[in-house]
Structure formats: structure tokens, C-alpha cells
């Protein structure tokens, strides 16, 4: 990043002049944080606590089951993606507290803010994989009986992670530190080397591959699944599907502000009032997207309570019940309506 472009929210459009330097700053701007930044800090703190503990628990519960239970493989990978992203939060938190001063160096600037994008791509690709799995269970049960195994599930996850890493490379490559203001402040942001087309291309690819295309395909996928389930009046399957839809819906809800501001800023004139407003909201949009990293364990717990009627079991056993039920076809030939319903019902929340 030979130039430091603040027009795509890759965690950072920091042109404010606030400073916490102990020496007297030249500028007379307030040392108090902006309201959006304060809100972002609160969200980061909550997400870190819930995300680290919740996802660690999910990893612990599913890791033991991953060898024999395909659902556990899905949830293990989702939890790992969320857990990894949560590890960057203390650094991002510290940076906002210091008015976006970045004292952590160039390598950390490239890696840590990119983790949320890795999480976005990994999560949506894993959700797509899980959704395809659910679709096949409902519509191609015989194929599932013959080919659906742990090995294939791990391959699918590896492909999802590989693609996610590949799609995160632009953010990683175009991210650098630089200094501005008096007294000097180190900033971490993206730089597209005076290439507006490249910047817009990155924003469009992110919007299409990380949001619009998955939204379209998953909506179609779950519409078919729900129609099939409702047509068979499988009430428990519908309950389970509600959980699945909740996780998928939460992904799109929490990424929406980030994606909208990102695409808008890549097309707006940097001096325009709208751009300047969006720039101030950037940290908040990032923190809102980060809610994805802690929401899944919450959904699993709520789902577990729903399935149990009330919380009678311990948290690990409740999660185990939600996350590791397997959708295996036990009888080779008899694919009755009830068998298919049972499979749909047992493929638990995304």
C-alpha cells in the first residue's frame, strides 16, 4: 500500500486528530472518544467475553465428536473461525481506545484486522457447505447414505478455509501502517496505490462473494428445505430449521452495515459529507460485524433450552445435544417420508 486509502472499511479509516499522547498535542480537538467508537468498544468487550468462552466451549464439545459426527465437524469449524477472530479483539480494542493509534507494527496491521474478513469468508463458505449438506439430506437421502462421511466433510471444510484465505489476501496485501499528525500517530489502514478501480473491485467482490451471492443461494436453499418440511408437517424439523435460519439470518444482519458502508465509501468522493459520516461510523460497523463471532454459541444455547423445554442439563451436555446429533440413514432401503423427516430434524442448527 504505497498510498493509504481510507475508502474501504477494512478496519480503518482513521483520519481523526484526537490523541492520547502525554505531551501537549498541537490540535485542540477533544481527547474524548466519539460516540460510535465508545459503542464499538462496548460491543468488542462483550463479543470478546462471550465469543472466546462460548466458542471455546463449542470447540471443546465438538472436538471429541468430530471423528464420528458430521454435524460436529461443521460446528467445530464455525467455532474455530469465530474463536480466531475474537483473539484479535484486545488489539483492536486498544487501538480504538488510543484514538486509532496503532502501536503493534506492520505485520500485526496486515494480519489482525484481516481476521474478521477471514471469518466472514470462512463462515459464509462453511454455512454454504452446511446448507448444501442439509439440502442433500432432505432431497438426496440415498446419495447421503452412500457418500456422506466424515472424510468428505473435512475435505469440504478444507476447501472452504482455502477459499476464505484466498479471498482475504487483498485485505492482507493492501494493509499498511503509516504516520500522520502532530504529535505523530501511527495509523493502520488499506492502501490501493492510487488505484480507485482496484479499490472498488475489492469492495464489489467482497459484497458479491461475501454477501449477495450467499444471500441469494442460501435463501433459495432454505426456501426449498422449508417448503419440503412444511409439506410433510414435520413440526420438530421446523423447530430445528428455525435455528438454522437464525444462524444464517444473523450472519447477513450483522454484516449488512459493514457491506453497505464499504461499497458506498469506495464510490463516494472522500471529501463528501456522506463519506466523512460513514468514516466516523466505521469502527461501529466493524464491531457490529464482530457480533457474528459470538452469536452462534448463544443461538445453540437458546436452541438447546428450547429443545429441552427448560435448562435441566449442564451447558456442555446441552451443547452436545444440539451440536452432535447425527443425521445418518440407518436403514439402507426404506426411505419413507418419516425417515426423510427424521434426517431433516436431526441435522441440527447451522
Amino acid at each position: 500500500m504505497d498510498s493509504f486509502n481510507y475508502t474501504t472499511p477494512d478496519y480503518g479509516h482513521y483520519d481523526d486528530k484526537d490523541t492520547l499522547d502525554l505531551n501537549t498535542p498541537v490540535d485542540k480537538t477533544s481527547n474524548t472518544l466519539r460516540v460510535p467508537d465508545i459503542l464499538a468498544l462496548v460491543i468488542f468487550a462483550v463479543v470478546f467475553l462471550v465469543g472466546v468462552l462460548g466458542n471455546a466451549l463449542v470447540v471443546w464439545v465438538t472436538a471429541f465428536e468430530a471423528k464420528r459426527t458430521i454435524n460436529a465437524i461443521w460446528f467445530l469449524n464455525l467455532a474455530v473461525a469465530d474463536f480466531l477472530s475474537c483473539l484479535a479483539l484486545p488489539i483492536l480494542f486498544t487501538s480504538i481506545v488510543q484514538h486509532h493509534h496503532w502501536p503493534f507494527g506492520g505485520a500485526a496491521c496486515s494480519i489482525l484486522p484481516s481476521l474478521i474478513l477471514l471469518n466472514m469468508y470462512a463462515s459464509i463458505l462453511l454455512l454454504a457447505t452446511i446448507s448444501a449438506d442439509r439440502f442433500l439430506l432432505v432431497f438426496k437421502p440415498i446419495w447421503c447414505q452412500n457418500f456422506r462421511g466424515a472424510g468428505l466433510a473435512w475435505i469440504a471444510c478444507a476447501v472452504a478455509w482455502g477459499l476464505a484465505l484466498l479471498l482475504t489476501i487483498p485485505s492482507f496485501l493492501y494493509r499498511v501502517v503509516r504516520e500522520e499528525y502532530f504529535p505523530p500517530k501511527v495509523l493502520c489502514g488499506v492502501d490501493y496505490s492510487h488505484d480507485k478501480r482496484r479499490e472498488r473491485a475489492v469492495a464489489i467482490v467482497r459484497l458479491v462473494l461475501g454477501f449477495l451471492w450467499p444471500l441469494l443461494t442460501l435463501t433459495i436453499c432454505y426456501t426449498f428445505i422449508l417448503l419440503r418440511t412444511w409439506s410433510r408437517r414435520a413440526t420438530r424439523s421446523t423447530k430445528t430449521l428455525k435455528v438454522v435460519v437464525a444462524v444464517v439470518a444473523s450472519f447477513f444482519i450483522f454484516w449488512l452495515p459493514y457491506q453497505v458502508t464499504g461499497i458506498m465509501m469506495s464510490f463516494l468522493e472522500p471529501s463528501s459529507p456522506t463519506f466523512l459520516l460513514l468514516k466516523k461510523l466505521d469502527s461501529l460497523c466493524v464491531s457490529f460485524a464482530y457480533i457474528n463471532c459470538c452469536i452462534n454459541p448463544i443461538i445453540y444455547v437458546v436452541a438447546g433450552q428450547g429443545f429441552q423445554g427448560r435448562l435441566r442439563k449442564s451447558l456442555p451436555s446441552l451443547l452436545r445435544n444440539v451440536l452432535t446429533e447425527e443425521s445418518v440413514v440407518r436403514e439402507s432401503k426404506s426411505f419413507t417420508r418419516s425417515t426423510v423427516d427424521t434426517m431433516a430434524q436431526k441435522t441440527q442448527a447451522v
Partner: antibody, heavy 118, light 112 residues
Framework: QVQLRQSGPGLVQPSQSLSITCTVS????????VHWVRQSPGKGLEWLGV???????DYNAAFISRLSISKDYSKSQIFLTMNSLQTDDTAIYYC????????????WGQGTTLTVSS | DIVMSQSPSSLAVSAGEKVTMSCKSS????????????LAWYQQKPGQSPKLLIY???TRESGVPDRFTGSGSGTDFTLTISSVQAEDLAVYYC????????FGGGTKLEIK
């Protein structure tokens, strides 16, 4: 490659205003700050002010009342405007890019020679 | 305001000799947050725009010959040219960018 090209009047009458344009290429104004520095005949360098990547400005206290720096992102241009010119404002005026690290001036314009005389 | 003073104001040396010039600031240029000294050295050859040589007191700008070395911390800084070449004929300025930038008066280097 990075370039800063300056254009402006060579001669201005006392009490008049000065306008110099610095057109940049090879980098984006959304990414780098641009400073203005002047050098009076036979004298040293004097920092005038800066416009940062986000559009905020800082000025030398000695010039704050009569100096203004602005920019046009789309045209990659920075503008220096100075009012109430006196003969001691005769100098070479430079625009310079703020470096990525160190808050230094890593690329300079060719300079605009200004003579304030009646 | 931070005031920068350079010494000597001029010096004449023969090619191949070692040269040191001094720069002092009225207050420390060490930033507690970044742990860097915000002092830079510039070279201005006759009829040319200034050129950045050193930043952060001791970091050489890319493309600058390694005979140029910056040192010092806090308020006292030095630029050393280990073996002066004919093309080094210039005025050398130090500049602080810890706060609003201020240049030193310059040291004129002449070749005997």
C-alpha cells in the same frame, strides 16, 4: 512514479493574494498528507502548513491568519492561498508529500518562485 | 514552539574526509507513544529542491548512500558523512516533526 508539479504566478503585488496549485501523480490524496514549505532568498526552509489525507489542516502559527490550504481529491490537486502579501513573502514555495513513516517530506515539488513587488 | 539550532553554519572539507554536523532541539523529540525520535535530515543541492536523507533520527531513506548516518536521541542529534564525495556539496537541514515542523538554520558543506 511519484511526482508533484507546481503552478502559480511569478509576480504578485503587495497586499494581493497568492494562489499556488500542486498537482500530484503516482499516489492518492486520500492516502497522504501534503505540506507547504517556503525558502526566502539566501535563507533557510520555513514550514507553512499541511493538509492531511482526511482533509484536516495544520498551520504554522505565524501564518494562520492569512494562509489556507485545500484540495480537490478528484483532480489530485492541493491549493495554497496566502493573503495580504508583503515583500518579505518573496520566496520559493514548495509542496511536499508527507512520508509514510517518520512524518517527513519524502517527495518535493520543483518549487514556485514568487516575487512580491510593486 | 520547538526551536532547532544547527552547528556549524558552514564547513569546508576535502573529499574522502569524515564530516559531522550537529542539531539541537529546544525540547525532546522522543515520542513516548511511538518510542521514536522525530528528527529528519535533508540535503539541498544548489538550485534543487530538498531531498530526504534520514528520518526517525537514524533511519536512512531508501536510495541514500550508506556513508550518511544519523544518530542521537532526545535533544541532541548528529549527521555524519563517513567519506565526503564531491557530489555532497550542499546545505544540510535538520527538521523536527514531533510537533508542528521546524527546520534548523542549515549547515553549508563546501568541498576544498
Amino acid at each position: 512514479q511519484v511526482q508533484l508539479r507546481q503552478s502559480g504566478p511569478g509576480l504578485v503585488q503587495p497586499s494581493q493574494s497568492l494562489s499556488i496549485t500542486c498537482t500530484v501523480s503516482g499516489f492518492s490524496l486520500t492516502s497522504y498528507g501534503v505540506h507547504w514549505v517556503r525558502q526566502s532568498p539566501g535563507k533557510g526552509l520555513e514550514w507553512l502548513g499541511v493538509i492531511w489525507s482526511g482533509g484536516s489542516t495544520d498551520y504554522n502559527a505565524a501564518f494562520i491568519s492569512r494562509l489556507s490550504i485545500s484540495k480537490d481529491y478528484s483532480k489530485s490537486q492541493i491549493f495554497l492561498t496566502m493573503n495580504s502579501l508583503q515583500t518579505d513573502d518573496t520566496a520559493i514555495y514548495y509542496c511536499a508529500r508527507n512520508s509514510r513513516l517518520g512524518n517527513c517530506f519524502d517527495y518535493w515539488g520543483q518549487g514556485t518562485t514568487l516575487t512580491v513587488s510593486s | 514552539d520547538i526551536v532547532m539550532s544547527q552547528s556549524p553554519s558552514s564547513l569546508a572539507v576535502s573529499a574522502g574526509e569524515k564530516v559531522t554536523m550537529s542539531c539541537k532541539s529546544s525540547q525532546s523529540l522522543l515520542n513516548s507513544r511511538t518510542r521514536k525520535n522525530y528528527l529528519a535530515w535533508y540535503q539541498q543541492k544548489p538550485g534543487q529542491s530538498p531531498k530526504l536523507l534520514i528520518y526517525w533520527a537514524s533511519t536512512r531513506e531508501s536510495g541514500v548512500p550508506d556513508r550518511f548516518t544519523g544518530s542521537g536521541s532526545g535533544t541532541d542529534f548528529t549527521l555524519t558523512i563517513s567519506s565526503v564525495q564531491a557530489e555532497d556539496l550542499a546545505v544540510y537541514y535538520c527538521k523536527q516533526s514531533y510537533n508542528l515542523p521546524a527546520f534548523g538554520g542549515g549547515t553549508k558543506l563546501e568541498i576544498k
